[in-house]
Interface confidence: low
């Protein structure tokens, strides 16, 4: 797994995400340069070293840890896009609801996607819960439905306009993580200029019976505290030619990743510019929601 | 645009490769499919291959029909044909729906004839 | 298997009336359905998908409703050149769903 190996091999060959973003930095070792960009930031801010603060650390989603595996070690899965945002469930609050074998999840995102640039494809990512007997083998089977709420035109608070963005099944007979294509509403969402879009997520029973304790449950993993958060991933595309992607790569490696440490948090690199840190780095690059991946 | 091409006639068990070339359509990013029609007949689904390289089939398809493609040609292999393969053939690109898709765009398709 | 079945086979209506077409769905495949036109010797060319949206081009004559397992496509003011074969499709589901056919076996329109 190129995550688990980070210091193991070159960045060129585990990085296929990142294909010539570092290109012109042949035969430069990246925990050097590395370091180097570390020494610089903290010979600004008058210090030797940094400060360890544990409870400031963000751990990158699993799923794009996931991802980023999968384009690593499989190019021909990664689509054509030079850009990969992700942005997590922001609705904290809501809780699903649930009555004869329905059971409706409200999400809420907040995408910002610049018009400029073209999305080639977004996905929500939902991790489902198999909640099962352990002595029944079948799966759960169910049906299920991704709403998009639209605002309402009327006066009545109560009528909501739902389109239906994704309809489909799952047979679940683990938790993992479901991709439902949901492109063409973000590519509306990127034209509309509203940044705030809430999802609904409905689950019904297959066969229109109530779930019970012998057929399973299958539920959609909201808790915020942990990395089954519901993902939104957008691929885009940004136009520019190569020339200007790597200008603006060079300009974003100088500028852009050292002021964003702290969204990290700082102690990933109190250890010396390890595996962590790498995988910080590189997850800030893959997983921030403004910040960008080049191909 | 879409243009299918290596209908011809065929004795039955002979494999017979049909293939789509697309032009102004990045298949990295597209949904393509192959449909069919026999002579007076409706229009009959046989599978579909995504951006990703995924592919699916018809139930009654499965085993018998293989799709793949390159930067620039969906291919349609059918690997021993019989009588009832007698039909058009014909390629389209889907507007992806989760792992599926409607048909915007249609080859003018090839007719492919099976017989002894 | 999802199956769509269409009805009638053939309909014939005289210019300037109204064609109704239904096409049922043997499960909910909630508003995933397109509606296509062929005329002989050509492809398919699509009308309407989402059940109801009208493919950018396509008259305004040309109406689809319905959602879950009953769809209809309504042509309003029949014209000549509306001869030809309709079909419905659905796209539910993803790659764990099996299809017979998509498809419906289709409706002729004969217009006097």
């Known amino acids: 797994s190129p995550i688990m190996n980070l210091e193991q091999s070159p960045l060129e060959e585990d990085m296929s995400l990142f294909g010539d973003v570092f290109s012109e930095q042949d035969g430069v070792d990246f925990n050097t340069l590395l370091q180097s960009m570390k020494d610089e930031f903290l010979k600004t801010l008058n210090l030797s070293d940094i400060p360890t603060q544990d409870s400031a650390k963000v751990d990158p989603p699993e799923y794009m840890l996931e991802l980023y595996n999968k384009f690593a070690t499989d190019r021909t899965s990664m689509p054509s896009a030079n850009i990969i945002r992700s942005f997590k469930n922001e609705d904290l609050f809501s809780q699903p609801v649930s009555f004869n074998g329905l059971r409706k999840y409200p999400l809420l995102f907040n995408v910002s996607i610049p018009h400029h640039e073209e999305v080639i494809m977004a996905e929500l990512r939902l991790y489902t819960l198999v909640q099962r007997d352990r002595m029944i083998y079948d799966g759960v089977d169910r049906k299920i439905t991704i709403f998009e709420v639209l605002e309402s035109k009327g006066d009545n608070e109560g009528e909501r306009n739902m389109l239906v963005l994704v309809s489909g099944e799952i047979y679940g007979t683990n938790s993992e993580w479901e991709t439902f294509d949901v492109t063409d509403a973000i590519r509306r969402w990127q034209k509309s200029g509203s940044s705030t879009h809430q999802l609904e997520v409905h689950i019904e029973s297959k066969h229109d019976e109530a779930e019970d304790a012998s057929s399973g449950r299958l539920e959609i993993d909201t808790s915020a505290q942990n990395k089954h958060n519901p993902l939104l991933i957008v691929f885009s595309d940004d136009q520019s030619s190569d020339k200007e992607r790597k200008e603006e790569l060079n300009e974003m490696i100088s500028h852009e990743q050292l002021p964003e440490l702290d969204n990290l948090g700082l102690d990933s690199f109190s250890s010396g510019p390890g595996e962590e840190a790498l995988l910080q780095m590189r997850s800030n690059i893959i997983y921030d929601s403004t910040a960008r991946i080049r191909r | 645009s879409l243009e299918e091409s290596g209908g011809r006639l065929v004795t039955p068990g002979t494999a017979l490769t049909v293939t789509c070339t697309v032009s102004g359509i990045d298949l990295s990013r597209n949904l393509m499919s192959w449909v069919r029609q026999a002579p007076g007949e409706g229009l009959e689904w046989i599978g579909s291959i995504n951006f990703r390289n995924i592919t699916w089939y018809a139930s009654w398809a499965k085993g018998r029909f293989t799709i793949s493609k390159t930067s620039t040609t969906v291919d349609l292999r059918i690997s021993s044909p019989t009588t009832e393969d007698t039909a058009t053939y014909f390629c389209?690109?889907?507007?992806?729906?989760?792992?599926?898709?409607?048909?915007?765009?249609w080859g003018q398709g090839t007719p492919v004839t099976v017989s002894s | 298997d999802i199956v769509m079945t269409q009805t009638p086979a053939s309909v014939e209506a005289a210019v300037g009336g109204t064609v109704t077409i239904n096409c049922q769905a043997s499960?909910?495949?909630?508003?995933?359905l397109a509606w296509y036109q062929q005329k002989p010797g050509q492809p398919p060319k699509l009308l309407i998908y989402?059940?109801?949206k009208l493919e950018s081009g396509v008259p305004s004559r040309f109406k689809g409703s319905g959602s879950g397992t009953q769809f209809t496509l309504t042509i309003n003011d029949l014209e000549c050149d509306d001869a030809a074969t309709y079909y419905c499709?659905?796209?539910?589901?993803?790659?764990?769903?099996?299809?017979?056919?998509?498809f419906g076996g289709g409706t002729e329109v004969v217009v006097k």
């Open positions: 499709q659905t796209y539910w589901g993803g790659d764990g769903t099996s299809y017979l056919n998509p």
């Open positions: 389209a690109r889907g507007v992806y729906v989760n792992s599926n898709g409607y048909y915007s765009l």
């Open positions: 989402g059940a109801s």
């Open positions: 499960q909910s495949v909630s508003n995933l």
